[in-house]
């Protein structure tokens, strides 16, 4: 459940360099890119994963409506900051020194500035509505079937409590899953919502994150269940900050 | 925090049956609760499962369809059974995980007995 | 994901010691618990996560294995620990028959 002695390598992070050099000349993991070590017996932060994966050779009507302070990750892939335990650090920069406040999923929550730009503190997220569509099957997958497996899924496979899983709304084709997460509610040891849900994006576009682990292969009373595009909505405890002309 | 089932009986073969566990000192919401049973001088089976939080459940694969599980009160969940026949005679127990997000049943109760006989 | 344990009993003197293994039809990812269970009382939780003991289990108990391959050790045998003992796999609860092994009964002499 930690990083495998056998083979030194590590289950829930392929995107890491493992030795026999930790206490004891037990596994050791590192991430890529930022040389951090990790928890092999979890989910890695988003942080650490962007920071690896940028440091890698490059090759309706029982549906939520995301609210006006919902964000979504339109900028892509940046080379991010961490700090010393994988969170983003709220300031983020790039090389031209362009700057910007991110939450705790790493998603731009304000304008881009310049060097004097101040982020007090890192925003948590503690709402996030992954919105998905699956391909057309014959009949319409039934509900409590298909809420009965998402959670599970959460649960087994990113090891996220089922009590975070707020909600599974369902109107052929779109499928929505509401993760909820306070900071009052996260605990020692519990997987962030965040992360969670980033792993789950990274399944559903066949780029697993998992080491030898296969891919996802979600089934719904054995019927596949395949999904043909993904959206996340992010919500902030404290709404972001954009100045009108980004809204008009 | 303990639990406690209720509900065992001698029935007849092709009766219903639902049992009961209490829990005390703990709230349910941050758990999964687990039915497993065990047959005189068998071992033990997974019969099914329920996440509070969510509702949702999970079953055996031969258990599914003829068991269901339901949180009936903040305090208790149910199992029910129905076309009983002589091998569902078993002491069955109400198990809770541990908190985190594997299946380790860390808190049992002690049983209860149901007898399936003409 | 089915769980196979061997033996199905096994004796030993005080002061001995006993093993027993476990295999998964699957990986698990030592994601496993062994449980002792003594006549007219709930199964105990005596090891976690493959190695890990439980609160309160002496350290004669020792878990191993990953991956398929699993085994608890017992030494320095008690009176006290004769029972009989179970795995069970805590990775998944989606279609599978029994989480459970099928136990093993340990006499102590």
């Known amino acids: 459940h930690t990083a495998a002695q056998d083979n030194c390598t590590c289950p829930t992070n392929k995107m890491t360099v493992c030795s026999p050099d930790g206490p004891g000349g037990r596994c050791q993991c590192r991430a890529l890119g930022s040389g951090v070590a990790v928890d092999c017996s979890t989910l890695t932060s988003k942080c650490l994963l962007l920071k690896a994966r940028m440091s890698a050779p490059k090759n309706a009507r029982t549906l939520v409506r995301p609210n006006e302070h919902a964000l979504v990750d339109n900028d892509g892939l940046y080379d991010p900051d961490c700090d010393p335990e994988g969170r983003f650090k709220a300031r983020q920069c790039n090389q031209t020194s362009v700057c910007w406040c991110v939450n705790s999923v790493g998603v731009r929550r304000t304008d881009k500035g310049d060097l004097s730009l101040r982020c007090d503190e890192l925003v948590r997220t503690h709402h996030i509505l992954i919105d998905l569509r699956h391909r057309p099957t014959a009949s319409a997958f039934n509900h409590s079937d298909l809420d009965a497996e998402l959670r599970r899924l959460f649960r087994e496979r990113y090891r996220l409590h089922p009590k975070f899983v707020a909600a599974v709304h369902y109107e052929q084709p779109t499928i929505q899953i509401e993760l909820r997460q306070n900071t009052s509610q996260k605990a020692a040891g519990d997987v962030d919502i965040g992360d969670a849900a980033y792993y789950f994006e990274r399944d559903v576009k066949g780029e697993s994150l998992f080491q030898g682990r296969g891919g996802l292969d979600l089934r719904v009373r054995g019927e596949p269940l395949q999904v043909e595009r993904t959206l996340i909505y992010y919500l902030d405890e404290i709404p972001p900050k954009f100045s009108m002309k980004r809204l008009t | 925090q303990s639990l406690e089932e209720s509900g065992g009986d001698l029935v007849q073969p092709g009766a219903s049956l639902t049992l009961t566990c209490k829990a005390s000192?703990?709230?349910?919401?941050?758990?999964?609760m687990l039915w497993v049973r065990q047959a005189p001088g068998k071992g033990l089976e997974w019969i099914g499962c329920?996440?509070?939080?969510?509702?949702?459940t999970y079953f055996a694969s031969w258990a599914t369809g003829r068991f269901a599980i339901s949180k009936t009160s903040s305090t208790t969940v149910t199992l029910q059974m129905t076309s009983l026949t002589a091998a569902d005679t078993a002491t069955y127990f109400c198990?809770?995980?541990?908190?985190?997000?594997?299946?380790?049943?860390?808190?049992w109760g002690p049983g209860t007995l149901v007898t399936v006989s003409s | 994901y089915d769980m196979t344990q061997t033996p199905a009993s096994v004796s030993a003197a005080v002061g001995g010691t006993v093993t027993i293994k476990c295999q998964a039809s699957?990986?698990?990812?030592?994601?496993l618990a062994w449980y002792q269970q003594k006549p007219g009382q709930p199964p105990k939780l005596l090891i976690y996560?493959?190695?890990d003991l439980a609160s309160g289990v002496p350290s004669r108990f020792k878990g191993s294995g990953s991956g398929t391959e699993y085994t608890l050790t017992i030494s320095d045998l008690e009176c006290d620990d004769a029972a009989t003992y179970y795995c069970?796999?805590?990775?998944?609860?989606?279609?599978?028959?029994?989480?459970f092994g099928g136990g093993t009964e340990v006499v102590v002499k």
């Open positions: 198990a809770r995980d541990d908190g985190t997000t594997s299946y380790y049943l860390n808190l």
């Open positions: 000192g703990f709230d349910l919401n941050n758990y999964a």
């Open positions: 329920i996440y509070i939080s969510g509702g949702t």
């Open positions: 699957e990986d698990i990812y030592s994601l």
């Open positions: 996560d493959a190695s």
């Open positions: 069970q796999q805590a990775y998944t609860i989606g279609n599978i028959d029994n989480a």
